[in-house]
C-alpha cells in the first residue's frame, strides 16, 4: 500500500476478536488508495539554471578558482534550496558565429577542464543534485543555431548527446528553439537519443515564442518534452490574465507534465516589478508542474540595480562585497548572507516554498482546480487523495480586497472547508498556522497566501 | 574612483626584511585579490602572487616561497607584502594590483587594470 | 608554467609609422586571458588590451591586438609622440601569471 499520511487508529482486542491490529481511518472508510503515478526526478522540485558560471561564482575575490570548481563549493547552498537539478551552461567551446569552432564535446577552458565537471558530477550525485547541460551551440553569437548550417549544427548536437550522457549527465537543455528550422523533427530525434539512453534523463527544449499555438506545436510530437517559454510573462501580471494563461495551458496540453517559468533563461526581475516576485514564487511553487528558475531568483537578483553589471548576466549577490566598485551600491539585504540570516526574506520563503513542494503530496503530483475570486485575484486548490489539501489565492493587485472565493466552481472531490490554517504569507504580519475563515478572507495589495486543510470524506 | 597608495622606497640591508603596504580606496576593499608584482631595475614584471582581502588565503609563486608573506587589514583596506632574507638581487619596484571586471562577447575578464604607484626597494650593504 | 617570449626586442620607428608587436607563448593560452600592457619610465604598467583583442576602457582605437593560441599581436596603426614606451603581454589564464620580457618601441 502507498505510504499515504493517513491517520493511524489503533483498534481495541474487543474490536476485533482478541487480534490487536492497526487499522487505518481510510481501511475504515473502505475508498482503496488512490494509484499514485510514475514521478520522475523533475516532477519533485525545481530546476536552478546557472547560464552564466562566471557571474553565478562572483568575481573579484572569487576569480582565480575554475567556475566549474567554484559552483562544486557553492553545492551546498544549492541543497539548502531543495533545488532538484541544475541546468548548467552552456559551457563548450564557441567562437562567436563560427561553426567550425564551436566544439560541443570540449568545455571552454574560461570555465575549467573536463575534470572539473567530472568531480562536479560526482559531488553533485552523493547531493542527489542532478546536472542537466546546456548544449545551446552557437551561445556567444548572433543566432544560437547557425541558421544556414543547421544540419552540420545538428548532427553536433547528436554527438554531443551521446558523449555527455556516457560522461554521465542526467539532461539536456536547448534554447531558442524557434530558431531552429524543423526544430520539432530535431528535438524528437534528441528526444530519443536522450530516452533511449535511459527513461531517467531530460530534455528541455527553450524558445522566446509566447504564442501558445507555436508552444503546442513544438510539444505535440514530443511527448515527455520539458519546454521553457515567454508564455506566462505575457500576463501583463494580472490575476484574471494570468488565470486564464495557466487554465488555457493546462486545457490545451491535456494535463501533460509542463514547467512553469516567466522564460526560457531571464531573471524574474527582468520582468517583475520588486514588489510581486513573492506572489510569483508562491505561484511557480503551487502550480502542477516543474518550477524552472535562474540563478539569483531567490534573492530577487536585479541587474538594473547594478551599474555597469550586463542584463543578462548580473553576478551573483553572496555578500556585500560581491558588487565592490561602488561601495554602497549592494545592501545586506540583496544578498544571500543578508537574506539567509533574515527569516522574512525572499530567500527564506523560497526555501520554504521549495520544501513544501518537495515533500507534499498533493503539491507534488496533486490536482489542479481553479476557481473564481474577486477581481484581480488567481485562486486554486492543489489536492490529493486522502492527503493534506493546498489553498492558494493570489492578489496581483495594487489595492486590498476581499478574497470573495467562489467554492461553486469546484467539483464535489475539491470542496472547500469553512476554515483553513495559514501555512503562509507572502507578507508580514499574519500568524501562521492560525486558522481562518474563508469567507472573510481579505488580502493586502500583492498579497499571496498559501493555506491548508484536511482530506474531509 | 579605484586607488592603490602605495608606501614610500625603503633602503634595506641584505638580510633584512621589508615590509610594503598598498592602501586601497574607491571600491569595497574585501571584493578583490590584490596582485604584488615585482620589477628589477631595467627588466621585465613579474607577479609574485595574491591574497584574499575576504578570507586572508593567500598564493606565492615557488620562487618566494618561505620568504614572501602577504597579509591585510581590512579595518583600514590595506594590504602588505612583507620578504625577507633580502639579498641584493631583490632591488626591485614593487607592485599591488587589482583586476577590474569586463564582460564581453559573453565572457567575464579580469585584467589587472589598477596599478598601485610603486615601491622602490634598495637592497644593499 | 607558460613562458611567453616578445618579438623584437626593440622597436625603432618614426611618429605615424605602424607598429606591430608579436608575443608567443610556449604553450596553448585561453585568448580570453591574454593582455598588453604600456609602461613608461617611472611609472606603473598601463592596461591597454585585454582578452587579447578588447581594449581596456579609454584607450584610443589607433591600438589593436590579435591572435589566438600561441601567437598574439598589438598594433599600433599610427604612432604619436605619447605611444613611446615599453610593452608587455602577460597571460592571466593559467597560474603562475606571467609576463614577456618587453619589448621597447623607441623614435628612430
Known amino acids: 500500500h502507498h505510504h499515504h499520511h493517513h491517520e493511524q487508529k489503533l483498534i481495541s482486542e474487543e474490536d476485533l476478536g482478541g487480534e490487536q491490529k492497526l487499522i487505518s481511518e481510510e481501511d475504515l472508510r473502505a475508498p482503496r488508495c488512490r494509484e499514485l503515478p510514475a514521478q520522475k526526478w523533475w516532477h519533485t522540485g525545481a530546476l536552478y539554471r546557472i547560464g552564466d558560471l562566471q557571474a553565478f561564482q562572483g568575481h573579484g575575490a572569487g576569480n582565480l578558482a575554475a567556475p566549474i570548481s567554484g559552483l562544486k563549493g557553492r553545492l551546498d547552498y544549492l541543497s539548502s534550496l531543495k533545488v532538484k537539478g541544475l541546468v548548467l551552461g552552456p559551457i563548450h567551446k564557441n567562437q562567436k558565429d563560427d561553426v567550425a569552432q564551436t566544439d560541443l564535446l570540449q568545455i571552454d577552458p574560461n570555465f575549467g577542464s573536463k575534470e572539473d565537471f567530472d568531480s562536479l558530477l560526482q559531488s553533485a550525485k552523493k547531493k542527489s543534485i542532478r546536472v542537466i547541460l546546456d548544449l545551446t551551440p552557437n551561445y556567444r553569437g548572433e543566432n544560437s543555431w547557425f541558421s544556414t548550417q543547421v544540419d552540420t549544427v545538428a548532427t553536433k548536437v547528436k554527438d554531443a548527446l551521446e558523449f555527455w550522457l556516457q560522461a554521465g549527465v542526467d539532461g539536456f537543455q536547448v534554447r531558442d528553439i524557434e530558431n531552429l528550422k524543423d526544430a520539432s523533427s530535431f528535438l524528437a530525434e534528441w528526444q530519443n537519443i536522450t530516452k533511449g539512453f535511459s527513461e531517467d534523463r531530460l530534455l528541455i527544449a527553450g524558445t522566446n515564442s509566447s504564442d501558445l499555438q507555436q508552444i503546442l506545436s513544438l510539444l505535440e510530437s514530443n511527448k515527455d518534452l520539458l519546454l521553457t517559454s515567454s508564455y506566462l510573462s505575457d500576463s501583463g501580471s494580472t490575476g484574471e490574465h494570468t488565470k486564464s494563461l495557466v487554465t488555457q495551458y493546462l486545457n490545451a496540453t491535456g494535463n501533460r507534465w509542463c514547467s512553469w517559468s516567466l522564460s526560457q533563461a531571464r531573471l524574474l526581475t527582468s520582468f517583475l516589478p520588486a514588489q510581486l516576485l513573492r506572489l510569483y514564487q508562491l505561484m511557480l511553487f503551487t502550480l502542477p508542474g516543474t518550477p524552472v528558475f535562474s540563478y539569483g531568483d531567490e534573492i530577487g537578483l536585479d541587474a538594473a540595480a547594478l551599474p555597469g553589471q550586463p542584463m543578462e548576466a548580473p553576478v551573483m549577490l553572496w555578500d556585500e562585497s560581491s558588487f565592490p566598485d561602488i561601495p554602497g551600491a549592494v545592501s545586506a539585504n540583496m544578498t544571500v548572507k543578508g537574506q539567509s540570516e533574515d527569516p522574512g526574506s525572499l530567500l527564506s520563503l523560497f526555501r520554504r516554498l521549495s520544501d513544501q513542494r518537495s515533500k507534499e503530496r498533493s503539491l507534488l503530483h496533486g490536482d489542479f482546480h481553479a476557481f473564481s475570486a474577486g477581481p484581480g485575484l488567481f485562486s486554486y486548490i492543489r489536492h490529493w487523495d486522502q492527503n493534506e489539501r493546498f489553498l492558494v489565492v493570489l492578489n496581483f493587485g495594487d489595492v486590498g480586497l476581499s478574497a470573495g472565493l467562489q467554492a461553486s466552481d469546484l467539483p464535489a472531490s475539491a470542496s472547500l472547508p469553512a476554515k483553513a490554517d495559514l501555512l503562509l504569507s507572502t507578507q508580514p504580519g499574519r500568524e501562521e498556522g492560525s486558522p481562518l475563515e474563508l469567507e472573510r478572507l481579505k488580502l493586502e495589495p500583492h498579497e499571496g497566501l498559501l493555506l491548508r486543510f484536511p482530506y474531509a470524506a | 574612483q579605484v586607488q592603490l597608495v602605495q608606501s614610500g622606497a625603503e633602503v634595506k640591508r641584505p638580510g633584512a626584511s621589508v615590509k610594503v603596504s598598498c592602501k586601497a580606496s574607491?571600491?569595497?576593499?574585501?571584493?578583490?585579490?590584490i596582485h604584488w608584482l615585482r620589477q628589477a631595475p631595467g627588466q621585465g614584471l613579474e607577479w609574485m602572487g595574491w591574497?584574499?582581502?575576504?578570507?586572508?588565503?593567500?598564493n606565492y609563486i615557488q620562487k618566494f616561497q618561505g620568504r614572501v608573506t602577504m597579509t591585510r587589514d581590512t579595518s583600514i583596506s590595506t594590504a602588505y607584502m612583507d620578504l625577507s632574507r633580502l639579498r641584493s638581487d631583490d632591488t626591485a619596484v614593487f607592485y599591488c594590483?587589482?583586476?577590474?571586471?569586463?564582460?564581453?562577447?559573453?565572457?567575464?575578464?579580469?585584467?589587472?587594470?589598477?596599478w598601485g604607484q610603486g615601491t622602490l626597494v634598495t637592497v644593499s650593504s | 608554467e607558460i613562458v611567453l617570449t616578445q618579438s623584437p626586442g626593440t622597436l625603432s620607428l618614426s611618429p605615424g609609422e605602424r607598429a606591430t608587436l608579436s608575443c608567443r607563448a610556449s604553450?596553448?593560452?585561453?585568448?580570453?586571458?591574454l593582455a598588453w600592457y604600456q609602461q613608461k619610465p617611472g611609472q606603473a604598467p598601463r592596461l591597454l588590451i585585454y582578452?587579447?583583442?578588447s581594449r581596456a576602457t579609454g584607450i584610443p582605437d589607433r591600438f589593436s591586438g590579435s591572435g589566438s593560441g600561441t601567437d598574439f599581436t598589438l598594433t599600433i596603426s599610427r604612432l604619436e609622440p605619447e605611444d613611446f614606451a615599453v610593452y608587455y603581454c602577460?597571460?592571466?589564464?593559467?597560474?603562475?601569471?606571467?609576463f614577456g620580457q618587453g619589448t621597447k618601441v623607441e623614435i628612430k
Open positions: 594590483a587589482r583586476i577590474q571586471v569586463y564582460y564581453d562577447g559573453g565572457i567575464y575578464n579580469y585584467p589587472l587594470h589598477h
Open positions: 574607491g571600491y569595497i576593499f574585501t571584493g578583490y585579490y
Open positions: 591574497i584574499n582581502p575576504n578570507s586572508g588565503d593567500t
Open positions: 604553450q596553448s593560452v585561453s585568448s580570453s586571458y
Open positions: 582578452g587579447a583583442s
Open positions: 602577460q597571460q592571466y589564464g593559467s597560474s603562475p601569471w606571467t
